[in-house]
Structures are given as structure tokens and as C-alpha cells.
């Protein structure tokens, strides 16, 4: 069977990192310098991606797999391997078109990326506000205004901490 | 032009281990990628092994893990170790230098007139 496949199609024994040069009679060529064939039997090699500008190189092209590219600092990625770089914000701001902006109030963002997003609504679980909000931070919910009431407490008091070797009377 | 002229064939038995050479001469200074080729009788010519002047290898599924190309630049020789050979590795081995690339082609390609590498009990 691997002889009548072979003189069937003779590209199909080109293995990765090679191509079926029709210039040289469709034997197995070694890609050319920049360009790389990520599977066996291709017919073609193709060029490796660039990592210019902004972009940086993670990881170099070889002749079986492409350049991969991550973003310069102050930049992440966005897209599908990286296919464009995003400009890094504080916490507690969004990028719009006109740049950086600060979380409007009752918004947060606790990344660099991304947008603002409101404050958890602590009631609609019947829970009250323990910590306020802040641009950088989502509130911190805590026991519901009935757990609160006199003589209960918000907090789990410790356990007694016990002298090693002793067991509990 | 190169010139290129291999050595190291000759019968050996399944198991055993050959050390093929291909020295090149000539416009050396141009060459991107040594590659090893390989014919059988009546059969197609198949690639086997490559590297290229970065120093990027390439192998043949059917030889992977058994063969290993390399190079002397001190002596303009790029080697082939074959170990654990097989009767089906039995062929006429070609060394072929590839010069630089165009964007269409390779700029030329010189061929040994090859070594022949029976394996055989």
C-alpha cells in the first residue's frame, strides 16, 4: 500500500517542515528561509508571521511552525493569537476612543483591560453592603440587615486555641 | 557551481549502523540546505534528512529517531548517521545542496552522483 500511494502521490511522504516543489519534479524540498509547513504533504510553504511594531516575538518561526507574537509592554493581546494588541489601562479605568478614562461611579474594573462594570447589587440577595465600592474594587457583600440584628453577630467568633497535647475537656 | 561527493556506503546487516559523508566544493559559501535524498529501484526519489545553514533539521517520518544529519563547516561535510537500519532502507543515497531562494525557486540545485547502502542478512 505505502509503494501505490507513494507513486501515486508523490507529495504525500513530504513531512513536515518540507514541501512538494514542482520546480524540482515534485521531490521533498526544505522550506525556504521565513516560511514554514506545519503538516506533511503540503504543496507550499508559508511565510511566517512577522512580529513588528508593537507586537513582540514569543515564540521564533521555525520550518515547522509560525512565529507566535504577544504584545510589547503597556499593550495586551486581543483576537485569536494575538491578531492585535490592545492598549493597557489602570485599574479602575476603561479604554474608549478618546483613551483611558476613569470608571464612572458605581463602576469598577479591579484589570488593566477591559471595561467597567457596575457594582454587585447587594440587596437583590437580600444581603447588605459590607465594603463600599471603589473604581477598583466591587463592593463586599455581607449578612443580610435581619442577620444583624441586637446580640447577633456578623462574625464567627475564633475556637479556644488549645495547649498542644491536651485534649478537649 | 558545488561539487559534491559521497562515502561511507556498503552492505550491512538489519541492526547494524553506516555513517554516510557528502563533502561539498566549489561556491560553497551559497548553499542554504544539504539534503539527503534516497532511490530504491524502480521507485520514486524520497527525501530522508535535511539542515539547513541556520542549522535547522528536518527528517523523514520513516527515519525519525534513527537517522541523524549533521554538518562539519570546518570541512564543508555534512554527515548521515543511520542506526538500527532496516532492509527497507536499502537505496542509493543522494546528497543534493540547494542555494539560496529566490521567492520562486531555489537558486540552484547540485546533486552527488550517490552512494549505494545495502541492508542485508
Known amino acids: 500500500f505505502e509503494r501505490t500511494r507513494s507513486l501515486q502521490d508523490p507529495c504525500s511522504n513530504c513531512p513536515a517542515g518540507t514541501f512538494c516543489d514542482n520546480n524540482r519534479n515534485q521531490i521533498c524540498s526544505p522550506c525556504p528561509p521565513n516560511s514554514f509547513s506545519s503538516a506533511g504533504g503540503q504543496r507550499t510553504c508559508d511565510i511566517c508571521r512577522q512580529c513588528k511594531g508593537v507586537f513582540r516575538t514569543r515564540k521564533e518561526c521555525s520550518s515547522t511552525s509560525n512565529a507566535e507574537c504577544d504584545c510589547t509592554p503597556g499593550f495586551h493581546c486581543l483576537g485569536a493569537g494575538c491578531s492585535m494588541c490592545e492598549q493597557d489601562c489602570k485599574q479602575g479605568q476603561e479604554l474608549t476612543k478618546k483613551g483611558c478614562k476613569d470608571c464612572c461611579f458605581g463602576t469598577f474594573n479591579d484589570q488593566k483591560r477591559g471595561i467597567c462594570r457596575p457594582w454587585t447589587n447587594c440587596s437583590l440577595d437580600g444581603k447588605s453592603v459590607l465594603v463600599n465600592g471603589t473604581k477598583e474594587r466591587d463592593v463586599v457583600c455581607g449578612p443580610s440587615p435581619a442577620d444583624l440584628s441586637p446580640g447577633a453577630s456578623s462574625v464567627t467568633p475564633p475556637a479556644p486555641a488549645r495547649e498542644p497535647g491536651h485534649s478537649p475537656q | 557551481a558545488v561539487q559534491l561527493v559521497e562515502s561511507g556506503g556498503g552492505l550491512v546487516q538489519p541492526g547494524g549502523s553506516l555513517r554516510l559523508s557528502c563533502a561539498a566544493s566549489g561556491s560553497i559559501f551559497s548553499i542554504y540546505a544539504m539534503v539527503w535524498y534516497r532511490q530504491a529501484p524502480g521507485k520514486q526519489r524520497d527525501f530522508v534528512a535535511s539542515i539547513t545553514s541556520g542549522g535547522s533539521t528536518i527528517y523523514a517520518d520513516s527515519v525519525k529517531g534513527r537517522f541523524t544529519i549533521s554538518r562539519d563547516n570546518a570541512k564543508n561535510t555534512t554527515y548521515l548517521q543511520m542506526n538500527s537500519l532496516k532492509p527497507e532502507d536499502t537505496a542509493v543515497y543522494h546528497c543534493?545542496?540547494?542555494?539560496?531562494?529566490?521567492?520562486?525557486?531555489?537558486?540552484?540545485?547540485?546533486w552527488g552522483q550517490g552512494t549505494q547502502v545495502t541492508v542485508s542478512s
Open positions: 543534493n545542496s540547494l542555494g539560496s531562494w529566490d521567492g520562486e525557486r531555489y537558486e540552484y540545485d547540485y
